[in-house]
Interface confidence: low
């Protein structure tokens, strides 16, 4: 979890009760609490978007919010790979990309997010309510997976919210590492909470700067990483009727929309638990001006300040020349 995560704005204390210094110390425990709860808890977000211009078009985007290095990303449909899902694409940060019909184009958007272009092909045609899952294998966190699909009543041009169904194969090293890093902060937090326990707890309010709207600063803090918002369109046949896979490149220019991470209880589960893991439905969606549906109160994913972009479909460390990494 990135440390620049947004924290809900706090209700200012009543005038006269506390000065500026007191307000700062009141905010600090909540900042630390957020970090203690979320730091070291990676998240996977998944977004499925249908284009308004082409009713049969989808874009699937997935991202990993964690500090570890990604070793492999697997995108599947029809459920997680271990529970009847079928692999659509596998992306390796150094060795390249593999994809299968009906996948048209898989690509890295950033070091920690990918997008997938799909198009139905015969019996492989997915329906509008098809579930797409992304699994990120990362060190030291382990493997994390989340699934998403378009709501049955989705309007064209709008995207489904990131759907939470994170599946963790916990990595002991990750757990121990996170524990060590957080120990000091959490002890300090308890100390501060004890000092402030006689004060009334502040009421949480939604941030005044709407966290539902895509924000370039939060989404792409560095100048280079602003290109991460340049997203390809996708194509999928949603009618569940046979379709022919053609070879033309997808149409469309940049789509300036951001996605939000999943927020759900991350519980350790083995692959056997995938089949029984329900994919909860999400409610309370807020429409935003650019056609993004987002859950109220959620924040956009963060990319690190040192983010390197890999628009080349061959991946981030693709070598040049005919013998380069493919």
């Amino acid at each position: 979890m990135r440390t620049e995560a947004q924290v809900p704005a706090l209700q200012p204390p009543e005038p006269g009760l506390e000065g500026a210094m007191g307000h700062r110390t009141l905010v600090l425990p909540w900042v630390l609490l957020t970090l203690c709860v979320t730091a070291g808890t990676p998240e996977v977000w998944v977004q499925v978007r249908m284009e308004a211009t082409e009713l049969s078009s989808f874009t699937i985007r997935c991202g990993f919010l964690g500090s570890g290095s990604i070793s492999l990303v697997t995108v599947s449909w029809g459920g997680p790979n271990g529970a009847g899902g079928t692999t659509l694409a596998v992306l390796h940060p150094e060795r390249g990309i593999r994809q299968w019909a009906p996948a048209r184009q898989a690509r890295w958007e950033t070091q920690s997010s990918i997008s997938l272009i799909l198009e139905g092909s015969g019996a492989s045609s997915p329906c509008a309510n098809t579930t797409f899952c992304c699994k990120f294998a990362s060190f030291p966190e382990g493997s994390w997976e989340a699934c998403g699909s378009l709501p049955p009543s989705s309007d064209p041009g709008l995207s489904a919210p990131p759907t939470p169904a994170p599946i963790l194969r916990a990595d002991l090293a990750g757990i121990l590492g996170v524990s060590g890093v957080l120990l000091f902060g959490c002890v300090y937090l308890l100390h501060l909470l004890r000092r402030h326990k006689h004060r009334p707890a502040p009421r949480l309010q939604p941030s005044r700067t709407s966290p539902q709207a895509p924000r370039a600063r939060a989404w792409a803090p560095s100048q280079a990483s602003q290109a991460a918002l340049h997203v390809p369109y996708a194509t999928i046949n949603t009618s569940c009727r046979p379709a022919t896979l053609d070879t033309a490149h997808p149409h469309g220019g940049p789509s300036w929309w951001a996605s939000l991470p999943t927020h759900a209880a991350h519980r350790p589960q083995g692959p056997a638990a995938w089949a029984s893991t329900p994919i909860p439905a999400r409610g309370s969606f807020v429409s935003v001006e650019n056609g993004l549906y987002a859950q109220a109160g959620e924040r956009p994913p963060h990319t690190g300040p040192g983010l390197t972009l890999f628009p080349d479909p061959r991946g981030p460390r693709a070598m040049e020349g005919p013998l380069g990494v493919r």
Epitope: H92, R95, I97, R98, Q99, R314, M319, L323, R326
Partner: antibody
Amino acid sequence: QVQLVQSGAEVKKPGASVKVSCKVSGFSLSHFSMHWVRQVPGKGLEWLGGFDPEEGGTIPAQKFQGRLTMTEDTSTETAYMELSSLRSEDTAVYYCATGIWYSSGWPVDYWGPGTLVTVSS
Amino acid sequence: DVVMTQSPLSLPVTPGGPASISCRSSQSLLDSSGYNYVDWYLQKPGQSPQLLISLGSDRASGVPDRFSGSGSGTDFTLKISRVEAEDVGIYYCMQALQTPITFGQGTRLEIK
């Protein structure tokens, strides 16, 4: 539709060379790496060579080092495999295939139809 | 080189019945990323091989769900829950952990 189209059957004499082509359509050759696999009639599959990220390029299996050359022409989206110093035991069906990857488990998702190379005096 | 050993080499089955093919590697195919780099292919008579299972257990697109892959490390299994006539051919396991990439000897599945 993704397709790999290979050149026609060849009959060669021992000691000669053979060059098999594999033209791809439906995807860009620059986004995929080509591997070559052969199958002696009635026998199993044998990997000749292909892309190895550890080496940073296309490499032959050690067994074929020195007499196997793999090249690609991205302008025509065609891959080539040339095997020299042919012996009778090189008689086999030669397949081009995309997607076998070293140390990453990429499967071969597309195969050419195969080119029968017969080495006979 | 990693040696892939398949068994049985010949597998006669009755239509509708189950089938199981074993593949053993001379060294572990489990990578640090947690994936097993073994793939299964079916070569039907007169055709090129076609992908069935990748990364040990991920069924390829368009492959019927009666096919499943399992196993980890050095022991892998391909199962067909209900064999159909169209499933006849030679099944190969392949390791992609290191070069040279190697295949099993193949298992010929035939209908009784």
